[in-house]
Interface confidence: low
């Protein structure tokens, strides 16, 4: 999906008002220095591409983020403020349902959500890191 057509300010507002708090709740009890940020982005569309990938694509050791509160709110924000986004996600949603049976918070998931926090911060201050 091409994220260049999204309403970035509206997505930013959704992040600041709720998504950021849900990410913090998920990470509660984890030291902010525990994980190193290895994923970066430069422009806001690039950041959303990375955020979508980390939030909704199951990875080895963490297949369970899609049903978390921050993920559902992220999906809603993208669906509302990125024209045509919902249509591209139908197949992905089916795959997610098959991949995820129960909510399990693993260390790998914590690491992944830590990366997401970094990407969202970068989304609000693009250009901090480049290619």
């Amino acid at each position: 999906y091409d994220f260049t057509n999204c309403d970035f300010e509206k997505i930013k507002a959704a992040y600041l008002s709720t998504i950021s708090k849900d990410l913090i709740t998920y990470m509660s009890g984890t030291k902010s220095t525990e994980f190193n940020n290895t994923v970066s982005c430069s422009n806001r569309p690039h950041c959303l591409t990375e955020i979508q990938s980390l939030t909704f694509n199951p990875t080895a050791g963490c297949a369970s983020l899609a049903k978390e509160m921050f993920a559902m709110k992220t999906k809603a924000a993208l669906a509302i403020w990125c024209p045509g986004y919902s249509e591209t996600q139908i197949n992905a949603t089916q795959a997610m349902k098959k991949a995820r049976k129960s909510k399990v918070t693993t260390n790998k998931c914590l690491e992944q959500v830590s990366q997401l926090q970094g990407l969202w911060r970068r989304f609000n201050r693009p250009l901090l890191k480049q290619q």
Partner: antibody
Framework: EVQLVQSGAEVKKPGASVKVSCKAS????????MHWVRQAPGQGLEWIGM????????TLIQKFKDRATLTVDKSTSTAYMELSSLRSEDTAVYYC??????????WGQGTTVTVSS | DIQMTQSPSSLSASVGDRVTITCRAS??????LAWYQQKPGKAPKLLVY???TLAEGVPSRFSGSVSGTDFTLTISSLQPEDFATYYC?????????FGGGTKVEIK
């Protein structure tokens, strides 16, 4: 209304330094990055570098790393670019431009710097 | 560094003509390309960003498109005020680089 107002034209001798200012108004200064671009007479546009006014993080291209210094004064919403050890090839119009995603929606009017002995 | 090759370097056209300017990136920059118009003695003015998004206040006769690493700026019907120099610029990552420019002159 967003405005970037630059300092006036400068004439300098080779080896000297020049400091160009860019005063921003009409928006929150620390929200956008400030970039500097130059254009030699009859030539194209050349990117110099950028500064994040919120924390003064700076990136300069290799050819300017030793000679250019980018600074900001948050209290006056002003960005500065200082270029030292000037040579004739530095004769150009220097522009400041604001950006969030890397494209420039507002530019300063330009400052002409002439280096001549 | 990413190189931006812009063509042609100059062209002559008449009012009402359809004008196309192209820019090729040396590597994949996705949609991270902007187009600017510059008139003599003035700062560049943003026309298009993210390859195809028209900047605020820019007339609809201007449009941008992308195919792989090839980017196009089209002026559907050239107006007297459109005679100027046009630059492309990638905004994918540092260092930002510009194309060499295309001067659009009156035929």
């Amino acid at each position: 209304e967003v405005q970037l107002v630059q300092s006036g034209a400068e004439v300098k001798k080779p080896g000297a330094s020049v400091k160009v200012s860019c005063k921003a108004s009409g928006y929150t200064f620390t929200t956008y990055w400030m970039h500097w671009v130059r254009q030699a007479p009859g030539q194209g546009l050349e990117w110099i570098g950028m500064i994040d006014p919120s924390d003064s993080e700076t990136t300069l291209i290799q050819k300017f790393k030793d000679r250019a210094t980018l600074t900001v004064d948050k209290s006056t919403s002003t960005a500065y670019m200082e270029l030292s050890s000037l040579r004739s090839e530095d004769t150009a119009v220097y522009y400041c431009a604001r950006t969030l995603d890397g494209y420039y929606d507002y530019w300063g009017q330009g400052t002409t710097v002439t280096v001549s002995s | 560094d990413i190189q931006m090759t812009q063509s042609p370097s100059s062209l002559s056209a008449s009012v009402g003509d359809r004008v196309t300017i192209t820019c090729r990136a040396s590597e994949n920059i996705y949609s991270y390309l902007a187009w600017y118009q510059q008139k003599p003695g003035k700062a560049p003015k943003l026309l298009v960003y993210f390859a195809k998004t028209l900047a605020e206040g820019v007339p609809s006769r201007f449009s941008g498109s992308v195919s792989g690493t090839d980017f196009t700026l089209t002026i559907s019907s050239l107006q007297p005020e459109d005679f100027a120099t046009y630059y492309c610029q990638h905004h994918y990552g540092t260092p930002w680089t510009f194309g060499g420019g295309t001067k659009v002159e009156i035929k």
